[in-house]
Interface confidence: medium
Amino acid sequence: SGVFQLQLQEFINERGVLASGRPCEPGCRTFFRVCLKHFQAVVSPGPCTFGTVSTPVLGTNSFAVRDDSSGGGRNPLQLPFNFTWPGTFSLIIEAWHAPGDDLRPEALPPDALISKIAIQGSLAVGQNWLLDEQTSTLTRLRYSYRVICSDNYYGDNCSRLCKKRNDHFGHYVCQPDGNLSCLPGWTGEYCQQPICLSGCHEQNGYCSKPAECLCRPGWQGRLCNECIPHNGCRHGTCSTPWQCTCDEGWGGLFCDQDLNYCTHHSPCKNGATCSNSGQRSYTCTCRPGYTGVDCELELSECDSNPCRNGGSCKDQEDGYHCLCPPGYYGLHCEHSTLSCADSPCFNGGSCRERNQGANYACECPPNFTGSNCEKKVDRCTSNPCANGGQCLNRGPSRMCRCRPGFTGTYCELHVSDCARNPCAHGGTCHDLENGLMCTCPAGFSGRRCEVRTSIDACASSPCFNRATCYTDLSTDTFVCNCPYGFVGSRCEFPVGLPPSFPW
């Protein structure tokens, strides 16, 4: 669809005569008839197949034609057509004399024709005017013409329909050739597809309007590039949705079981070395001079009773010092200056001479010891505490401080490792001599049945069209993450494209 435009510029009829040579009375009141038709090698009479147009009287004899309206007529003259412009044409322009006001052909005398010109040729669609001048014996006509497309029609032949739009059906303007030019933020054949926020993950994100980034299930973050871990995941991360990969030192389905008590709680005191020995379990190796489960107790060097023969022990910064009773000397009061005559044996001990009376030996009654029977028997010397328990003298009695996993007066009882119900997900616990063992129910594995090994919902490859499958551990179901262009719970449906424009 387009318009053939003809701009009449100047008509010269100096003598004011008709084509027959007869003069007009009082002058030639001139109007024009235009016929536009298909290309003819020799322009001949016949239907004006592309259209006709007539002007009102534009002037008398010789005159210039104004660019807009003249006596109700239009200049340029418009010859619209509703077909593909063929690129060639024939044009007939007739100048007529109007004796009266009635310009209809049947109202004019046959000799009212002033002049007639006919041209034909090629004409491409375009904005530029072609200037032409036709001269006969008595007249001269100067004019220009062009073909332009109607609104919303484009292309070399005005055959491409395109109307700009910004609605549900598209967001575009039209280029000079009729192709679509998407508005900012839109793409696709009909500019219906929004351009998401820059960096929005291609598979895990989408948008319904430009510069948006909405996340598909299992993904989060401004660009939908962060996976959502399994619900309840405490000290873990994911690389695909619903995973819970434990950080170092943590275990269990939700990474909430502390496997590195040493690092997370630093229980050992006074520079002791900490060793993890299971979930929430540890052992402290004390530096010299310290004792206790957490090495929290400072050892006195006098605790080992190094002074003999009733010597008193005094702690010093660099060790200890023995204060010996009368008759004894030496670092530990081990040397005697007494004999049996001095009655050196205490607590009912019997004295026996040795080396011809140079020294002696005491035979002590039960519960007493020492070279002079001066010491009550140290209840800890016999190492009564079993299983590595630590013996502590407490006045007349003694007590055992047991290692983890043991109890009883002498640490002789093994605490059941199973008492804490360490096996997750209904696993059966078995006490072993050195620890425990879990027998896991179907669907779980690991030292404590903490790893879910249920049937992988993705094993049957339920997703189509190269979609990515994720197993939702909480429901044992799968989620398909569709590539662009596919939809459906299994990505089984291609996205249908809208029908093309009807040209």
Epitope: D167, G170, F501, P502
Partner: nanobody, 123 residues
Framework: EVQLVESGGGLVQAGGSLRLSCTAS????????MGWYRQAPGKQRELVAA???????YYADCVKGRFTISRDNAKNTVYLQMNSLKPEDTAVYYC?????????????????WGQGTQVTVSS
Amino acid sequence: EVQLVESGGGLVQAGGSLRLSCTASGSTFTSYAMGWYRQAPGKQRELVAAISSDDSTYYADCVKGRFTISRDNAKNTVYLQMNSLKPEDTAVYYCNAPHSDYDEEAPSDFGSWGQGTQVTVSS
């Protein structure tokens, strides 16, 4: 006043199909766009699919590839073919004329909402 009458809804199992029809009485809608909307309980009404006077189409992302909109101007009717239905498609479906700057605006007496047609998809 123009009456919009929707029909074709019903109860269907997931994966099934339905075809909805909407007829405008007392007017011809050749020169303006028509669309199908839906409203699920507790949710806002949303445009699902639309068709313009030159048969350009629009589909919401959630129905692309499953729903097809078409029109029969001679019968003053617009259709919505719904395939591979999902439980989340359950809603009351209405037809009306959405805004389009390409098409004529629907006349002022057009498009007070009809009764709609209930679509229920069971799993």
